[in-house]
């Protein structure tokens, strides 16, 4: 039960995280610049990964996609790439994890297959979260190190004189959304990996022998009720009178101890 809960919770946490990564990638407020002290413009300027916007004191707002001819920082392209890779990996991870969920039965999928899929999706979520955290951190570092050198002209209200001052950039809301979302995706991935360990069937140290009584299709094996159900025996309609005992390795698929959780 604990395995199912861990897996389900990991899936939900990752889902929320990936939704957050998508939201952060689409948001316009990655960096903000307050120009209200500029008597010429009196505007609030903010930039995203795909476009930059300006909001005037009157309420008028306009956004425009980046013009490549104005030159975009190389780091911006790197951040875009990291966020997109994070989203793609996260989306694939979600798809895989849906089929890996223990509470969902798809055909006769074995627990070992579900465990492998859970581990795969967990790793994908971890990498996705790391990509998002890396992307947001690279952008934040770019703000801290580069933006104070911006050549934008600002005007001070002191007597109407024109003065070029350092442009003040601050972290936009998207950065915090991205950090939290990346963290959630990472946590969800770790939870999926933990759940995978519980899902994986433990290998026995002995070879169980299944005994067949002539004329019956029930395999008698050590292990009580679960072993005596005949689950997995004679799956390919083999003759059951082919020589008595067979090792468990020869039988196609036996139930694991987790089948009745």
């Amino acid at each position: 039960m604990a395995v199912t809960a861990c897996q389900g919770l990991g899936f939900v946490v990752s889902l929320i995280g990936i939704a957050g990564i998508i939201a952060a990638t689409c948001m316009d407020q990655w960096s903000t610049q307050d120009l209200y002290n500029n008597p010429v413009t009196a505007v609030f300027n903010y930039q995203g990964l795909w476009r930059s916007c300006v909001r005037e004191s009157s309420g008028f707002t306009e956004c425009r996609g980046y013009f490549t001819l104005l030159g975009l920082p190389a780091m911006l392209q790197a951040v875009r790439a990291l966020m997109i890779v994070g989203i793609v990996l996260g989306a694939i991870g979600l798809l895989v994890s849906i089929f890996a969920l223990k509470c969902i039965r798809i055909g006769s999928m074995e627990d070992s297959a579900k465990a492998n899929m859970t581990l795969t999706s967990g790793i994908m979520f971890i990498v996705s979260g790391l990509c998002a955290i890396a992307g947001v951190s690279v952008f934040a570092n770019m703000l801290v190190t580069n933006f104070w050198m911006s050549t934008a002209n600002m005007y001070t209200g002191m007597g109407g004189m024109v003065q070029t001052v350092q442009t003040r950039y601050t972290f936009g809301a998207a950065l915090f959304v991205g950090w939290v979302a990346g963290g959630l995706t990472l946590i969800g991935g770790v939870m999926m990996c933990i759940a995978c360990r519980g899902l994986a069937p433990e290998e026995t140290n002995y070879k169980a022998v299944s005994y067949h009584a002539s004329g019956h299709s029930v395999a008698y094996k050590p292990g009580g009720f679960k072993a005596s159900t005949g689950f997995g025996s004679n799956t390919k309609n083999k003759k059951i009178y082919d020589g008595g005992a067979r090792t468990e390795d020869e039988v196609q698929s036996y139930p694991s101890k987790h089948d009745y959780v």
């Epitope: 300006v54 005037e56 009157s58 008028f60 104005l70 920082p73 934008a152 002209n153």
Partner: nanobody, 119 residues
């Protein structure tokens, strides 16, 4: 990316009027435009500004006498100067600022047009 060409300057008597024009050319229209002047032997002084949304602002020294306007279809900024005084004598520069469509805000300047107020 943005070229600014001012025109309309000249010699005018005190109390007279002049209309300055600033034609902006380029593939990107500006988000804010302004007129800035520099009197002989002095520093730059901001005169008036206008945003794409239509918000206007004026320096106290020109309020009530100067009017800034913008024709977005022609991509041109105007400065109507009335009741001119001798202290308005200066080289008037056009300034355009771009915030949208660029990651770093950009500022562009024209070459200036001389306005002389003298009797």
């Amino acid at each position: 990316q943005v070229q600014l060409v001012e025109s309309g300057g000249g010699l005018v008597q005190p109390g007279g009027s002049l209309r300055l024009s600033c034609a902006a050319s380029g593939e990107i229209s500006s988000d804010a435009m302004a007129w800035v002047r520099q009197a002989p032997g002095k520093g730059l002084e901001w005169v008036a500004g206008m945003t794409r949304g239509g918000s206007t602002n004026y320096a106290d020294s020109v309020k009530g006498r100067f009017t800034i306007s913008r024709d977005n279809s022609k991509n041109t900024l105007y400065l109507q100067m009335n009741s001119l005084r001798a202290e308005d004598t200066a080289v008037y520069y056009c300034n355009a600022e771009i915030y949208t469509g660029t990651f770093y805000p950009r500022s562009y300047w024209g070459q200036g047009t001389l306005v002389t107020v003298s009797s």
